[in-house]
Interface confidence: medium
């Protein structure tokens, strides 16, 4: 996939809603310039597109929703990067201008007479991207034609500002309850001295920024803090290690605000330089219960407790997508190209024959084969039954007691749309209520996972609590097994009696060398040594003074 | 096969480089070239490590800044030892850390004999 | 970096016999062990990599066991040609080093 040619899904329909998926992964640091995207992604590229497909087959077959209107979708992919996806927004909005500008699809000829031939329809709305950083960027192009973006994946806390991000919406909450859910957890196991690293891009840094804010608040001190690129080359990820390992074995917990891809450069880079269990990763909803993230590289990821969005897998989607076949799925134009690199084979005379494989893919291949639903495929699908919802409650209102497009409608109105969106309120895919708040933002509910070793050589994620509104539970015994096997990073141990916290000049306030308070002296708080007056001498305990028993001396008594 | 060269008598004090050559194989593939001394009648003793594909070096925690380890080319590593004293006194070794077979050594040279004295 | 204690430092065994030895890591290592076989002016030879997995080309004479923090070699059937010293190394590398055992010193009787 290089910049000059970028394929399309369309499905037709009376209104058509636009959608970019990461079909591909993002283009390496030396493709950048030329945007040549990487390979093909199953969960975060074909399942997406196939979940818009199909979940757009099940609205048009649903009576009691958008009654008489057919919605057809236009996929794009957005590679996971800012510049393929602004690109592809800009095909969107063209074909909006093109459509606005004729009556009813006729073009109006250079020399004044007019042609049958007829527009694409404009695309009413927007799902995704995916990344925060490339939806940022998408939404600043589609704001200025009013066209709603809502988000299945965005969780970036600067996405709330509607005085910035007027038209977009998502169906996950902002990453500031992530950032909470984190400390929370951080908390609950005294981690007090823990080092940091996000992925470069807003996603990582406006959630790192919110830990590390609401760390300070609670009395966590950050060994350090990194940034880097997913894409970053091997000598970058060994680099960063290098430095994380410099504050062993103080600060053993690593809180990664990360996308999968840096989790998985930082694995690598693990066993390159051969730190397997000598961190733990605590890591944000860019992990998740990725096993793309995990795969080679189990025995680095052990111990790993990652926070995943709330979102059980969708069977009647893997009922549709599970009996796919190249042979006869012709509407998704990369789903050949997704077979080949799936079971690393050739599709022989297949229009995408791809020579790199030697070997024929055989009729016997299937996607049951160590399949793995998408983990946030409920909320690709709760982001298209809000566009649905919304076009549905705006059909309401405005053609009232009439099935179909009535004029008041046409052409759709972004505005009136977005505010319609804004109402919405329907149970999702899981059977949880769908609603926006005032920032067009949901509600936080999350899931706690940790990856482990199940048995030998075979590693699993296993949901050890859940952070819901604020409240955090965790099954302790699951994570840890035993008490004493709860990892520990602090930066110095508490002061033994008598003794009080120095901290060294530059130092965070969690590092500090213990002193004790001299023979006369008492501890008055946890940095002060006090003198006790004369007359008084310390307490047993050193928390104060007590007065000295005055002793009258007599001719007679004996030498002391 | 890996050689090393650049031993000999050195004086107290001085500092000491010694290079480790590979032939039939380039350090542009990703290993460990590491370093390790033997004193006259006794045991293995660590210095450090270089990893080729990124530059990233370990070392032992004894060599408190007086030893670098740094590629050259894709077929040398050098091993600088500075301040030699007459405990440095060793036949050093080169080897080779693989990833196939989780970064044990499975090549080494045949060792290059320094002798600290004035 | 993590301290390799290798006993006895030296055994003697009759051909035929069988000989082992034991290595001993401060912290867990999980299985990031290698065995050595060194004979007087050669270089070290690798035996056993990741605790039990024999190098290629070595007799399965040899057998390593252990993890964590406890590993054997097993030098069973015993022939002349076993003499040598034998060390254990940390292959943890990282923040644990690769640290040798003090070694073993066979003799063949």
């Known amino acids: 996939q290089s910049s000059e040619r970028r394929v399309v899904a369309h499905m037709p329909g009376d209104i058509i809603i636009g959608a970019l998926f990461s079909v591909h992964h993002q283009p390496t640091v030396d493709k950048v310039h030329e945007r040549k995207c990487g390979a093909v992604r199953e969960q975060y590229g074909i399942q997406r597109v196939e979940a818009m497909l199909h979940t757009l087959e099940r609205i048009n077959s649903d009576p009691t929703l958008l009654p008489n209107i057919t919605l057809g979708c236009e996929i794009r992919d957005s590679c996971w990067h800012s510049a393929v996806a602004l690109e592809q927004s800009i095909e969107f909005i063209r074909d909006s201008l093109i459509s606005s500008e004729e009556e009813e699809g006729l073009v109006r000829c250079v020399d004044g007479s007019s042609s049958s031939f007829r527009s694409k329809k404009p695309i009413v709305g927007v799902i995704g991207p995916g990344s925060s950083s490339v939806a940022i960027q998408v939404q600043n192009l589609l704001q200025l034609f009013n066209i709603p973006q809502i988000a299945y994946s965005a969780t970036s806390m600067d996405l709330s500002d509607k005085t910035l991000f007027k038209y977009f919406m998502r169906v996950v909450p902002s990453d500031a309850q992530q950032a909470r859910a984190m400390v929370d957890i951080v908390k609950r196991y005294n981690w007090t001295y823990v080092s940091a690293v996000h992925t470069e891009g807003n996603y990582g840094e406006s959630g790192m920024e919110a830990f590390k804010d609401m760390s300070a608040k609670e009395g966590i001190c950050i060994a350090h803090s990194y940034k880097i690129y997913s894409n970053a080359g091997e000598q970058s990820f060994d680099k960063l290690l290098k430095k994380l390992t410099s504050h062993l074995p103080k600060a053993r917990v690593v809180a990664c605000f990360c996308e999968g891809m840096t989790v998985r450069g930082l694995l690598m880079a693990m066993r390159r330089l051969g730190l397997a269990g000598e961190f733990l990763l605590l890591g944000s909803d860019g992990w998740a219960d990725r096993y793309d993230v995990t795969d080679g590289y189990q025995r680095e990821a052990v111990g790993g407790i990652t926070i995943k969005l709330q979102s059980p897998d969708v069977k009647w989607f893997d009922d549709y997508y599970l009996k796919l076949r190249p042979e006869t799925n012709h509407r998704n134009p990369w789903f050949q190209e997704f077979w080949q690199h799936r079971f690393q084979c050739r599709l022989e005379g297949f229009p995408q024959e791809n020579s790199k494989y030697n070997k024929t893919c055989n009729s016997s291949l299937t996607l049951k084969t160590h399949h793995v639903q998408d983990s946030k495929m409920g909320f690709v699908i709760n982001a298209i039954y809000s566009m649905a919802y919304g076009l549905h409650n705006m059909q309401m209102s405005l053609c009232p007691g009439y099935a179909g497009l009535c004029d008041a409608m046409k052409p759709i109105d972004g505005r009136k749309l977005l505010e319609s969106l804004m109402k919405t309120n329907f149970t999702g895919v899981s059977g949880d209520t769908i609603l926006f708040d005032e920032n067009g933002d949901s509600p936080g509910r999350y899931e706690i996972m940790n990856f482990k070793e199940m048995g030998k050589d075979y590693f699993d994620y296993i949901n050890v609590g859940s952070w819901d509104n604020g409240e955090l539970k965790m099954d302790d015994d699951e994570v840890w097994s035993k008490k004493s096997n709860i990892i520990r990073s602090v930066c110095s141990e508490p002061c033994e009696k008598g003794q009080i916290k120095v901290i060294r000049k530059g130092e965070v306030s969690c590092c500090w060398t213990c002193t004790p308070c001299k023979e006369n002296e008492y501890v008055f708080d946890e940095y002060t040594c006090k003198a006790c007056q004369l007359g008084s001498w310390p307490t047993d305990d050193l928390t104060g003074c007590d007065l000295i028993p005055v002793q009258y001396l007599r001719w007679g008594d004996p030498e002391p | 096969s890996l050689e090393e060269s650049g031993g000999g008598l050195v004086q107290p004090g001085a500092s000491l480089t010694l290079t480790c050559t590979a032939s039939?194989?380039?350090?542009?593939?990703?290993?460990?070239i590491c370093w390790v001394r033997q004193a006259p009648g006794k045991g293995l003793e660590w210095i450090g490590c270089?990893?080729?594909?990124?530059?990233?070096t370990w070392y032992a925690s004894w060599v408190n800044g007086r030893v670098t380890i740094s590629s050259t080319s894709s077929t040398t590593v050098t091993l600088q030892v500075n301040s030699l004293t007459a405990a440095d006194t060793a036949t050093y070794f080169c080897a080779r850390g693989s990833g196939d077979i989780a970064w044990a050594w499975d090549l080494w040279g045949q060792g290059t004999l320094v002798t600290v004295s004035s | 970096d993590v301290v390799m204690t290798q006993t006895p430092a030296s055994v003697s065994a009759a051909v035929g016999g069988t000989v082992t030895i034991k290595c001993q890591a401060s912290?867990?290592?999980?299985?990031?062990l290698a065995w050595y076989q060194q004979k007087p002016g050669q270089p070290p030879k690798l035996l056993i990599y990741k605790a039990s997995t024999l190098a290629s080309g070595v007799s399965s004479r040899f057998k390593g066991s252990g993890s964590g923090t406890e590993f054997t070699l097993t030098i069973s059937g015993v022939q002349c040609a076993d003499a040598a010293t034998y060390y254990c190394q940390c292959t943890g590398y990282g923040s644990s080093g690769w640290t040798f055992g003090g070694g073993t010193e066979v003799v063949v009787k």
């Open positions: 912290q867990s290592i999980y299985t990031n």
């Open positions: 270089i990893y080729t594909g990124t530059g990233i």
């Open positions: 039939g194989f380039s350090f542009s593939s990703n290993y460990w």
